[in-house]
């Protein structure tokens, strides 16, 4: 069948997730390409728990999670709730700067170097993180 | 062996449509990313359309877009091509071809022998 | 889309000779580049992936080089069995992966 019961090779496998960590940089929309031809999707911070798992595979590198605004509010790429979920922005982030000099605003979010958010443009080639969920019917525990 | 071998191709008036299909074997189908590329007589390769492994995302160039869609049966090892709307600029070798992923980057590790469509009247 | 510009469009050389094709992008890919070759009639095959990674069972002679905007594939000592169209590829925005219009090798 096409359930995903264990994570692919060169995966992670953390609660019930698959995580993937690029090595390379994409803009944010060809990274997001890229986790969609894997059937999963651009990392959805749901938790600290989940964002120490995360912070702990990137390192101090500037990482895309699957955080925009392009259309307007913030939106998670998985259709979990922006406004009642983890949020883990630096102080005064997201502040949509224009000040950068290439056009329009800051769009989509990224980890930082010590892990918290900040919104910039989404065509830096910044590193990302692929995530897909194993599928509930393999989440249930054997039968004995 | 590693292989994928399309079939489908033919004419065809404008207008009209066609399905094509790639039969894998050799290697585990539904863990690949595939995807179409054409070939124009005489000219150089165009990506026209890709589709994921478990076939939950879907891909197509601008130009074949709202006229072609790509699917998967990865019961049956096959990929598939329907073209609908067939316009003669649509005339090509259509090969498919396996997505190889590493690290990051991508490219088209496998390719099939192709399959001519001519779109005439 | 990012388009790819491949030079020369072809060229004549013969075997022994050191070629060298050159690939350029619209804007930069980083080193999101791949080549392939084709003979008459047949698929492409799959040269080199990002930039300079050798495909498994591609002769040594073949190499590639470059980042950001320009590219060169470079087939060190050329061999009968070399002479074909080879086109360059970007996987950086992809999709859509776009390609060069391909550099035709052949017998001088």
């Known amino acids: 069948g096409s359930e995903r019961t264990c994570c692919p090779v060169n995966w992670v496998e953390h609660e019930r997730s698959c995580y993937w960590f690029s090595r390379s940089g994409k803009a944010w929309a060809d990274a997001d390409n890229y986790c969609r031809l894997e059937d999963a999707h651009l990392v959805v911070v749901t938790s600290w728990e989940e964002q120490k798992f995360v912070q702990h595979h990137i390192g101090p590198v500037n990482t895309w999670m699957g955080l925009h605004d392009q259309n307007g509010p913030w939106k998670w790429v998985d259709g979990t709730d922006y406004e009642t979920g983890f949020k883990n922005w630096r102080p005064e982030q997201p502040d949509d700067w224009y000040g950068h000099g290439l056009g329009g605003g800051e769009d989509c979010a990224h980890f930082t170097d010590d892990g918290r958010w900040n919104d910039d443009v989404c065509q830096r080639p910044y590193r990302w993180v692929c995530e897909t969920e194993l599928d509930k019917a393999s989440q249930e525990p054997p039968l004995l | 062996e590693v292989q994928l071998l399309e079939s489908g191709g033919g004419l065809v008036q404008p207008g009209g449509s066609l399905r094509l299909s790639c039969s894998a074997s050799g290697f585990t189908f539904s863990s690949y990313a595939m995807s179409w590329v054409r070939q124009a007589p005489g000219k150089g390769l165009e990506w026209v359309s890709a589709?994921?492994?478990?076939?939950?995302?879907?891909f197509y160039a601008d130009s074949v877009k709202g006229r072609f869609t790509i699917s998967r049966d990865n019961s049956k090892n096959t990929l598939y091509l329907q073209m609908n709307s067939l316009r003669a600029e649509d005339t090509a070798v259509y090969y498919c071809?396996?997505?190889?992923?590493?690290?990051?980057?991508?490219?088209?590790?496998?390719w099939g022998q192709g399959t001519m469509v001519t779109v005439s009247s | 889309d990012i388009q790819m510009t491949q030079s020369p469009s072809s060229l004549s050389a013969s075997v022994g000779d050191r070629v060298t094709i050159t690939c350029r992008a619209s804007?930069?890919?980083?080193?999101?580049l791949n080549w392939y070759q084709q003979t008459p009639g047949k698929a492409p095959k799959l040269l080199i992936y990002a930039e300079s990674s050798l495909q498994s069972g591609v002769p040594s002679r073949f190499s590639g080089s470059g980042s950001g905007t320009d590219f060169t594939l470079t087939i060190s000592s050329l061999q009968p069995e070399d002479f074909a169209t080879y086109s360059c590829?970007?996987?950086?925005?992809?999709?859509?992966?776009?390609f060069g219009q391909g550099t035709k090798v052949e017998i001088k």
């Open positions: 590829q970007q996987s950086y925005s992809s999709p859509p992966w776009t």
């Open positions: 071809a396996r997505r190889l992923a590493l690290d990051g980057y991508d490219a088209f590790d496998i």
């Open positions: 804007q930069s890919i980083s080193n999101y």
């Open positions: 589709i994921s492994g478990r076939g939950g995302s879907t």
